[in-house]
């Protein structure tokens, strides 16, 4: 089952798959210029069975003279972040990759891939926290969060890590900023079917869609 | 017949970002026809190669809301229009009501 | 382009009944493959993806099979409630394409 939300958003912190489990989806994104292949992938799935995991579905992108893209997301330069993962500014392996069955690794880079990598966790995945330069940590428990089910829905858990800069006092728990709890977040329930006609955020949140037409125009 | 239509597709309840956004129509007493895809994250498109050129699929993430615009309307685009969260491998979980498009003279 | 081929088009069931819809892709997909109910003016709804998995909510008398090239929608026991149009959609590359239907009618 996907995790519906994102992990926790830790202040100055990023956060790093070190493996990902079997299940999980990556977008096949392009960089600027290039899009993917007719009839190619939009995305690669960690798959495999008992003794071996892998990538399955290859992306590839492909020049292309036009681009019908909205919104296009410029990434910081000489920076290589991921949504739902973020690389991490200093190596961290509390994991050998190698010795988790049922994982694949980080997928090797392809040609004209985006700056950004967009994964889709499954329950069960692990992301480790860090704080990013310049910052450092007041662990009050592991510094990870995992995707677990509860009562039909998915939700993080919260990261145990405060980070601090290195020239402020240091923040004791008592006065810490409050962390908005995995508990306290709109979650998605995606057993609920659509509802088309109220679209007002529910105490149980549906997703939902609703469609209408916008304008017509007459040539 | 020639003129555009644009359908808009509001989403709630879920990251609008996290998913990319299917639109599939269906003509009366046909089946399902995939149009396109568009990542709600940064608007990369796949279009179904007989519309390429004549839709347009945009997203606004402010307001977790997609647009499929199709141009130059000819009778056979009379179709019952679709959106859909699409979770790729898991499946077009969440659908829309559906918007009727008639296309006559 | 991959094609999907739905059969049969059309069966004609009773309340009770087993049922069994089959679908075909023109090369292997794997297990990316997903299948919907559609009901009269309704939209449609996931049942199940990823050729076995059922869908939250969905009853458990609906199960799904195969891979590769074969895949199969099975209902265990037909329910008033089950009569409707049933698709098969591959997931594995685009243009993602849909089967052609297959509609359940009472006999």
């Known amino acids: 089952e996907l995790c519906d939300d994102d992990p926790p958003e830790i202040p100055h912190a990023t956060f790093k798959a070190m493996a990902y489990k079997e299940g999980t989806m990556l977008n096949c994104e392009c960089k600027r210029g290039f899009r993917r292949i007719k009839s190619g992938s939009l995305y690669m799935l960690c798959t495999g069975n008992s003794s071996h995991s892998s990538w399955d579905n290859q992306c590839q992108c492909t020049s292309s003279a036009t681009r019908n893209t909205t919104k296009q997301v410029t990434p910081q330069p000489e920076e290589q972040k991921e949504r739902k993962t973020t690389e991490m500014q200093s190596p961290m392996q509390p994991v050998d990759q190698a010795s988790l069955p049922g994982h694949c690794r980080e997928p090797p880079p392809w040609e004209n891939e985006a700056t950004e990598r967009i994964y889709h966790f499954v329950v069960g995945q692990m992301v480790y926290y860090q704080c990013v330069q310049g910052y450092r940590a007041l662990h009050r428990g592991p510094a990870e969060s995992v995707c677990k089910m509860t009562h039909g829905k998915t939700r993080w858990t919260q990261p145990q890590l405060i980070c601090t800069g290195e020239m402020e006092t240091s923040q004791f728990p008592g006065e810490e900023k409050p962390q908005a709890s995995p508990e306290g977040r709109p979650e998605s329930e995606t057993s609920c079917l659509v509802t088309t006609t109220d679209f007002q955020i529910q105490t149980e949140m549906a997703a939902t869609m609703e469609t209408s037409i916008f304008t017509t125009e007459y040539q | 017949p020639g003129a555009s239509v644009k359908v808009s597709c509001k989403a709630s309840g879920y990251t609008f970002t996290s998913y990319g956004i299917s639109w599939v129509r269906q003509a009366p007493g046909q089946g399902l026809e995939w149009m396109g895809w568009i990542s709600a994250y940064n608007g990369n498109t796949n279009y179904a190669q007989k519309l390429q050129g004549r839709v347009t699929m945009t997203t606004d993430t402010s307001t977790s809301t997609a647009y499929m615009e199709l141009r130059s309307l000819r009778s056979d685009d009379t179709a019952v229009y679709y959106c859909?969260?699409?979770?790729?491998?898991?499946?077009?979980?969440?659908w829309g009501q559906g918007t009727t498009v008639t296309v006559s003279s | 382009d991959i094609q999907m081929t739905q059969s049969p088009s059309s069966l004609s069931a009773s309340v009770g009944d087993r049922v069994t819809i089959t679908c075909r892709a023109s090369q292997s997909i794997s297990r990316y493959l997903n299948w919907y109910q559609q009901k009269p003016g309704k939209d449609p709804k996931l049942l199940i993806y990823a050729a076995s998995s059922l869908q939250s909510g969905v009853p458990s008398r609906f199960s799904g099979s195969g891979s590769g090239t074969d895949f199969t929608l099975t209902i265990s026991s037909l329910q008033p409630e089950d009569f409707a149009t049933y698709y098969c959609q591959q997931s594995h590359s685009t243009p993602l394409t849909f089967g052609g239907g297959t509609k359940v009618e009472i006999k």
């Open positions: 859909a969260r699409d979770r790729g491998y898991y499946g077009m979980d969440v």
